[in-house]
Interface confidence: medium
């Protein structure tokens, strides 16, 4: 009885097809597989970026695999052949492991790339980010940024760019057409007269750095002598109803601070007879149900129902900004 | 609109130390990011440090381990500590503030080095 043995897939490669972190990892299917014709190999791809305490581990009869990493860092991985019990008499077997590691050669000192980077989703609809000049650069120094995500073709680089000092220090993204739910990718790297600039890579989904705009159209009902409902409407734009979380404050004469999170458009709050002025103010955030995380809107206009008697239906409506 | 003006600059000995301090119109609580830039003769101006709101700095290679940046939110100040001062130090240094997507740099103070 010989033992059985299978190599290693070859020519294990990852390849870095210009997406900004988006690499490929292939291989070919291992020498001497003749036999094993009647069987169908498998494969097990173990990957990470360095420095991660885990690999993702994939188990696969393909040839190729592809998956985001940060390019900030170095990336390795391995992968073995696998032959399932029914090709080897009943005990799968493992090939060695095939290895390769993947990094971009940085150019220039750590301090040089950008900091405190900002990404921001405009109520679902604009997209800007922004970010401070890197240490011990010159004001020569410029910034680039380019981006990509699935169903783009090749990277983009930023047309629009906000700049401070004659640098660039931000973009403004165009339309970006069914670009949520899946990995964004950008770069930022930088040119200067005198001393290269290191690349700064990240990543995120843009669902959730969205600021939606603020709640509109507050009003007031009077629904019993002791309850009054607040409603308001939700801003102009893409997002539906569905998404919204939202947070209210509301002050009795000017001394009770009352905050609630609802999520409906609609707040019932149990009044005194005594009260003599409501005002409330509300803001929106995207909530976990279109959304992993937010960022939340500014306030709402604040809203306020004045009178005598807040159980006789006067109502004064003062729009002016909450601070 | 952010006003900016540095002092403590002067003449000093290879080897000596200066404090500079760079004092601002309005309040600086809200404003995430400052820094010291400087430009030597007939050279660009370049960041040397920062320091956001949480207190966390960055030093440009050249001045790591020599200066040290601070700031006092209650007193409206950034500040920039220069030990061990070189004659390559010798620059018009300014002062740095970034709320937002502007940008604010005052009108700058003399450091000479120089036995």
């Known amino acids: 009885d010989t033992e059985i043995k299978v190599n290693p897939p070859q020519d294990f490669e990852i390849v870095d097809p210009g997406y900004l972190g988006y690499l490929y990892l292939q291989w070919q299917p291992p020498l001497s597989l003749d036999h094993f014709k009647e069987c169908t190999v498998e494969y097990e791809l173990k990957y990470r970026n360095i420095g991660s305490e885990t690999w993702k581990t994939i188990i696969t009869k393909n040839l190729h695999y592809k998956d985001g990493f940060d390019l900030n860092k170095g990336i390795e991985a391995k992968i073995h052949t696998l032959l399932p019990w029914q090709c080897t008499n009943g005990s799968e077997v493992q090939s060695s492991w095939a290895e390769t590691t993947y990094w971009i050669s940085p150019q220039g000192i750590p301090e040089t790339k950008v900091q405190d980077m900002d990404c921001v989703y405009y109520n679902w609809q604009y997209l800007l980010c922004s970010w401070k000049p890197g240490i011990g650069v010159l004001l020569d120094t410029n910034y680039n940024l380019f981006y990509w995500y699935e169903g783009l073709d090749h990277a983009l680089q930023c047309v629009d760019y906000i700049k401070a000092d004659g640098q660039n220090i931000g973009c403004r993204f165009p339309y970006l057409e069914a670009s949520d739910y899946k990995d964004f990718y950008i770069c930022v790297n930088g040119s200067s007269e005198n001393k290269p600039i290191r690349s700064s890579y990240f990543t995120f989904q843009l669902q959730n750095i969205v600021k939606p705009l603020p709640p509109v159209y507050l009003t007031f009902t009077r629904e019993s002598s002791c309850e009054i409902k607040l409603k308001w409407s939700i801003p102009l734009g893409p997002i539906p109803a569905r998404c919204f979380d939202y947070e209210i404050e509301i002050r009795e004469d000017d001394t009770t601070l009352v905050t609630a999170t609802v999520e409906n458009e609609t707040y019932t709050l149990k009044t005194t007879n005594e009260t003599r002025q409501l005002c409330f103010v509300v803001r929106s955030k995207v909530n976990i149900y279109c959304s992993d995380d937010g960022i939340w809107s500014e306030w709402s206009d604040k809203q306020c129902w004045e009178g005598e008697d807040l159980s006789k239906k006067t109502l004064l409506r003062h729009h002016h900004h909450h601070h | 609109q952010v006003q900016l003006q540095e002092s403590g600059g002067g003449l000093v000995q290879p080897g000596g130390s200066l404090r500079l301090s760079c004092t601002a119109s309005g309040s600086i609580r809200g404003i995430g990011y400052m820094a010291w830039g400087r430009q030597g003769p007939g050279k660009p101006r370049e960041l040397i440090a920062t320091?956001?709101?949480?207190?966390?700095?960055n030093y440009a290679e050249s001045v790591k381990g020599r200066f040290t940046v601070s700031r006092d939110n209650a007193e409206n100040t950034l500040y920039l500590q220069m030990n061990n001062l070189k004659s390559e130090d010798t620059a018009v240094y300014y002062c740095?503030?970034?709320?937002?997507?502007?940008?604010?740099w005052g009108q700058g103070t003399q450091v000479t080095v120089s036995s």
């Open positions: 740095n503030a970034r709320p937002g997507l502007q940008s604010y």
């Open positions: 320091i956001n709101s949480a207190g966390d700095t």
